[in-house]
C-alpha cells in the first residue's frame, strides 16, 4: 500500500518535500514516477538512478529517500502530484498529493 | 560465455546517418537493461544512452538528445544504435555494455565500433 | 549533469607502491559510484561498484570507499598488470557520467 499525506502546504519562494511511503513485506520497488499532473517530474529506477525533467531539474532535487524536494516554489505549482509506484511481483500502486502554495506572509 | 560484439561502424560524411548493432550472447538479454558509451580517440569514456530491458525507458545523454536513437530487437539479441545528423564530435569508439543489475556498473563490454565522421 | 573530477589526472609509480586516486561530485551521489581499469587498446573493465564493493575476479588490492562527493580507488600493492587509465563513474542520476581518468604510469 502507499502511505502519504493528501494534503500540504507551502510558502511560495520556499520548497517542500514530497513524499509517498511503499510498505510491502514481499514486493521489491523497481520504479517511482513523479507527475505535476500529467506533467513528468522525475523518475526514480533502481537499475538507473534518478532521471530529473529538464523543465524542473532546477527546482527538483532527488530525496529523501524516494521522494522529491520541490523548490522555489511558485503559486503555478498549486495542484495534484502523482506517485506511482512500480514494484515486483506487486505490480503498480499509486499515490496522490494535493500541494497548496500560498503567498509568503 | 557473456560475449557483445559490435558492428556497423565506419567512415561517414557529416550530416550522414549509421546504425550501430550489437550482437549479444552467454546471458538472457531480454531482461536486461543495455548502455551505449563512446570514446573519442585518445579521450575519456562519455555515456551515450541506455534502454530497458523491454525497450522501454530510452535515456541519451544531452550531447546526442535528438539524433541518436537507442532500440533493440530481443527475438535477436541485439541493441541497435541509430546515428543521424552526425558531427565531426561523433567520431570515436562505440562500445555497447551490459550492466550488473541492480548495481549500476558496466560488467560486460564489446570490443567496441569504430565511427569517423568525416568529410 | 553530475561533473566528476578525478585527481590526479597521471602518476607515476612503481611496482610494490600504494596508489590513490580521488573522484570529487559535483552533488551529492550517495554511494552510486563505480571505477573502472582500461589499457589500451581493451575496453574498460569493472573493478568497483556502489563505491566500495568488489567485482567478482577483481584482486582484492584493489579498493574502494567514500560517499556523497569525495571517493577513493585505492592499489594497495601496484603490480605490473595494474599500469593503465582509471576512470570514475556515477550511477545516481541519468545522464550517467564519468571522470577524466587517471592514467597510472611507470616511474
Known amino acids: 500500500t502507499i502511505d502519504t499525506k493528501r494534503n500540504i502546504s507551502a510558502e511560495e519562494g520556499g520548497s517542500v518535500i514530497l513524499q509517498c511511503h511503499f510498505s510491502s513485506d514481499t514486493a521489491e520497488v523497481t520504479q517511482v514516477d513523479w507527475k505535476q499532473q500529467d506533467q513528468l517530474l522525475a523518475i526514480y529506477s533502481v537499475d538507473l538512478g534518478w532521471h530529473v525533467a529538464s523543465v524542473f531539474s532546477d527546482r527538483v532535487v532527488p530525496g529523501p529517500s524516494l521522494g522529491l524536494t520541490f523548490q522555489s516554489l511558485t503559486m503555478n505549482d498549486t495542484g495534484e502530484y502523482f506517485c506511482t509506484y512500480h514494484t515486483y511481483p506487486g505490480g503498480i500502486y499509486k499515490g496522490r498529493i494535493f500541494l497548496k502554495v500560498q503567498e509568503s506572509s | 560465455q557473456v560475449q557483445l560484439v559490435e558492428s556497423g561502424g565506419g567512415v561517414v560524411q557529416p550530416g550522414r546517418s549509421l546504425r550501430l548493432s550489437c550482437a549479444a550472447s552467454?546471458?538472457?538479454?531480454?531482461?536486461?537493461?543495455m548502455h551505449w558509451v563512446r570514446q573519442a580517440p585518445g579521450k575519456g569514456l562519455e555515456w551515450v544512452a541506455v534502454?530497458?530491458?523491454?525497450?522501454?525507458?530510452?535515456y541519451y545523454a544531452d550531447s546526442v538528445e535528438g539524433r541518436f536513437t537507442i532500440s533493440r530487437d530481443n527475438s535477436k539479441n541485439t541493441l541497435y544504435l541509430q546515428m543521424n545528423s552526425l558531427r565531426a564530435e561523433d567520431t570515436a569508439l562505440y562500445y555497447c555494455a551490459k550492466p550488473v543489475p541492480r548495481r549500476r556498473g558496466l560488467d560486460v563490454w564489446g570490443q567496441g565500433t569504430m565511427v569517423t565522421v568525416s568529410s | 549533469d553530475i561533473q566528476l573530477t578525478q585527481s590526479p589526472s597521471s602518476v607515476s609509480a612503481s611496482v610494490g607502491d600504494r596508489v590513490t586516486i580521488t573522484c570529487r561530485a559535483s552533488q551529492g551521489i550517495s554511494s552510486w559510484l563505480a571505477w573502472y581499469q582500461q589499457k589500451p587498446g581493451k575496453a574498460p573493465k569493472l573493478l568497483i561498484y556502489?563505491?566500495?564493493s568488489l567485482q567478482s575476479g577483481v584482486p582484492s588490492r584493489f579498493s574502494g570507499s567514500g560517499s556523497g562527493t569525495d571517493f577513493t580507488l585505492t592499489i594497495s600493492s601496484l603490480q605490473p598488470e595494474d599500469f593503465a587509465t582509471y576512470y570514475c563513474?556515477?550511477?545516481?542520476?541519468?545522464?550517467?557520467?564519468f571522470g577524466g581518468g587517471t592514467k597510472v604510469e611507470i616511474k
Open positions: 534502454i530497458g530491458a523491454d525497450g522501454s525507458n530510452k
Open positions: 563513474q556515477q550511477a545516481f542520476y541519468l545522464p550517467w557520467t
Open positions: 552467454g546471458f538472457t538479454f531480454s531482461s536486461s537493461y
Open positions: 556502489g563505491a566500495s
